[in-house]
Amino acid sequence: EICGPGIDIRNDYQQLKRLENCTVIEGYLHILLISKAEDYRSYRFPKLTVITEYLLLFRVAGLESLGDLFPNLTVIRGWKLFYNYALVIFEMTNLKDIGLYNLRNITRGAIRIEKNADLCYLSTVDWSLILDAVSNNYIVGNKPPKECGDLCPGTMEEKPMCEKTTINNEYNYRCWTTNRCQKMCPSTCGKRACTENNECCHPECLGSCSAPDNDTACVACRHYYYAGVCVPACPPNTYRFEGWRCVDRDFCANILSAESSDSEGFVIHDGECMQECPSGFIRNGSQSMYCIPCEGPCPKVCEEEKKTKTIDSVTSAQMLQGCTIFKGNLLINIRRGNNIASELENFMGLIEVVTGYVKIRHSHALVSLSFLKNLRLILGEEQLEGNYSFYVLDNQNLQQLWDWDHRNLTIKAGKMYFAFNPKLCVSEIYRMEEVTGTKGRQSKGDINTRNNGERASCESDVLHFTSTTTSKNRIIITWHRYRPPDYRDLISFTVYYKEAPFKNVTEYDGQDACGSNSWNMVDVDLPPNKDVEPGILLHGLKPWTQYAVYVKAVTLTMVENDHIRGAKSEILYIRTNASVPSIPLDVLSASNSSSQLIVKWNPPSLPNGNLSYYIVRWQRQPQDGYLYRHNYCSKDKIPIRKYADGTIDIEEVTENPKTEVCGGEKGPCCACPKTEAEKQAEKEEAEYRKVFENFLHNSIFVPRPE
């Protein structure tokens, strides 16, 4: 029997009866918050073999082992995870061992076993036999191994029953409890599972099977389950569902889950029955069960109940994330903020259509409107008094509307209004009239030529670069000396530069009036000699990196109320020279015969140019005499060389730390002080623990139903 869509057992241990007939839990299993210690011995669920999502145990008093509850749990698929984990055992006060002796596979996700004060038999389980990667496992704050004295079956009688594997250079017996070994399949099975009698299962089986080489005898399926058989792919007219089984179209059409109730039903896409079309696809019609690719970003219509959405902070902008069509009016009123331009672009950058009007007022933090980088149509279905559908008033630092060379914006109905934007040149407004098709709609007072652009250098001359020289981490550039009508109006130059992998940057990218700017700025004074061209050496740059550079002349902006000319260059793209690459990463070598070594590595993190080849050098070294000191035919444990790793696990240190041998002298001395890196790592670790605990509490503490 398949049970689903996730089972939450809390408060009352008798709710466990809900698991009675389950063979597969399609979803998660939570067992938590049972504060009264109970006797769980009468509860046993031998039918349960698979959990498709994750298993979470939290604060269950009196439960000492999971082995009696779930003796045949074989696979946790991890199709959906709990904070990256497929198995979470947290604050289980009485748990003494995990005991899931039939658990053979956790298909996806890691494990988190934390704050279980009495929990032992953790170091005796080889998780690498169950999980693909053990590096993300988090096993912390449990009973210290020294206090556990874990013994695998038969060890005391000197008739060990369990097999050995190596973990962290420790070659040891592997078991779940004092009487349950960890099952390992013969090497002849390779990646395949095996029966209790060590016969290899069918390749489509996962975890275990009741008969060898039979795809109908699997305990769980490696790929998909359909009509009693494990199959590599779902047969025609059936679709993958929840990552483990095949269902028909009717089943998919009829799913009504709590998670999907607001949607238009499940869809069939790419052979899978899923809750929504994946990223980049949209339903082929509102009630369709099929998906088609979106042209450009997928449309998402957002509507404001009160008709007008006020954007006065990043928080209010956040509500528009992903929206492509905004039904209503936008009122933008950003007076201050941190990194505001890029934040607004992140949340409003996909908006293509506004059905009503757009009003920007008192937005002193804005330098440009380029954060609305996809806006192409203002319908003007609703207009401000005076029939305005684009209204820009009193924005003290607004300098650019959009980059009109790369922007096509149409205002379908309504007029534009601009007033009291002292840094916005009227030429920029006139250009907008042309592009948006509003030329001729505005009356004389709608674009105020006196108080727009009054504090800007509006009629710009072009500065021309005269030379560029590059090295691996420097760029030297010079440009023509700019000569305004009155030389006293020229104060200095400002050079702007930044990394630009692509030639698509604009002057106002990431810039706002509150100090955030994606450009680096350097001031360049005028050369005292009038015949010397101004220039600069930009240093500390990265090798083989393309930079965008432009220069602006800093001029006095007003001369007796007349606009004066300013000057700036075009954006120049220039690449630094190549340099020596950083070292190749993760070098591994292994011998696959008596005369061969296989060496593998990853590319360097900083190639600093186009890598064309690697040089591999090797040399013969004398044999280590250490290898001859041990009789490898003896039954004793093979000695392991331990290398100090320079870190101390705080939780494990119980004796006086003043026992280390330091500086080559015999005798006690103090533990070395922690390095900054170690302190930082500890801080991050503590932070990570807090984040997980918060996530756990937020996920599981819910209001009591009814």
């Epitope: 029997e1 398949i2 049970c3 689903g4 869509p5 996730g6 089972i7 939450d8 809900r18 007939n21 389950c22 979803g27 089943f251 059409a253 009829n254 799913i255 009504l256 889950s257 709590a258 998670e259 999907s260 109730s261 238009e264 039903g265 509102s286 009630q287 139903p705 009814e706």
Partner: antibody
């Protein structure tokens, strides 16, 4: 496989309250779907009584609304029907059934309730 | 309430011959989302009803292709191209587009 099983007294006296329980196995009633009661008087057609939604809301047939209550016990994964002030006209086979987005996909086997003194 | 009226109420058939049942609703059963939630169920003697057709014309996976559904708005039809002995029972149409949901009164199909 989802299974629904009706249970309750087979005989109810007139003017009393008919109480039935539907025990669901294989699917959590809070996880999704609409959990329905349908009845069929002997030799007659099917009549929808109402449903209890996974989110706790109910919908009833207007002509029965004043007499009917559908509730749930999430800890036992059960939902129940209470029909008050019964008469002989309420004698029927009572079915519980699960409805998804489009159709009834699972039905109980039905339980006969006779209203008689 | 929307009234679903089936005809005929009784349909004697010869195995191998076609059969047709009509279902008419007292008002349109097109849902606001554009779908028409009309289903056909078969109740065999002593059993619970079982689904044959959903959303007017979608045959449930595993239902023989001799069963087909059609119609729109207020008029709907279930056709059996060649009746077989196992098809006997009472056929109900059902609308789930508007609450209260309603069944037709049923059509009894029996072998002549």
């Amino acid at each position: 496989q989802v299974q629904l099983q009706e249970s309750g007294p087979g005989l109810v006296k007139p003017s009393e309250t008919l109480s039935l329980t539907c025990t669901v196995s294989g699917y959590s009633i809070t996880g999704g779907y609409l959990w329905n009661w349908i009845r069929q008087p002997p030799g007659k057609g099917l009549e929808w009584i109402g449903y209890h939604s996974y989110d706790g809301t109910n919908n009833y047939k207007p002509s029965l609304k004043d007499r009917v209550t559908i509730s749930r016990d999430t800890s036992k994964n059960q939902f129940s029907l209470k029909l008050s002030s019964v008469t002989a006209a309420d004698t029927a086979v009572y079915y519980c059934a699960r409805y998804g987005r489009v159709f009834f996909d699972y039905w109980g086997q039905g339980t006969l309730v006779t209203v008689s003194s | 309430d929307i009234v679903m009226t089936q005809s005929p109420l009784s349909l004697p058939v010869t195995p191998g011959e076609p059969a047709s049942i009509s279902c008419r609703s007292s008002q349109s059963i097109v849902h606001s989302n554009g779908n028409t939630y009309l289903q056909w169920y078969l109740q065999k003697p002593g059993q619970s009803p079982q689904l044959l057709i959903y959303k007017v014309s979608n045959r449930l996976y595993g239902v023989p292709d001799r069963f087909s559904g059609s119609g729109s708005g207020t008029d709907f039809t279930l056709k059996i191209s060649r009746v077989e002995a196992e098809d006997v029972g009472v056929y109900y149409c059902f609308q789930g587009s508007h609450v209260p949901w309603t069944f037709g009164q049923g059509t009894k199909v029996e072998i002549k």
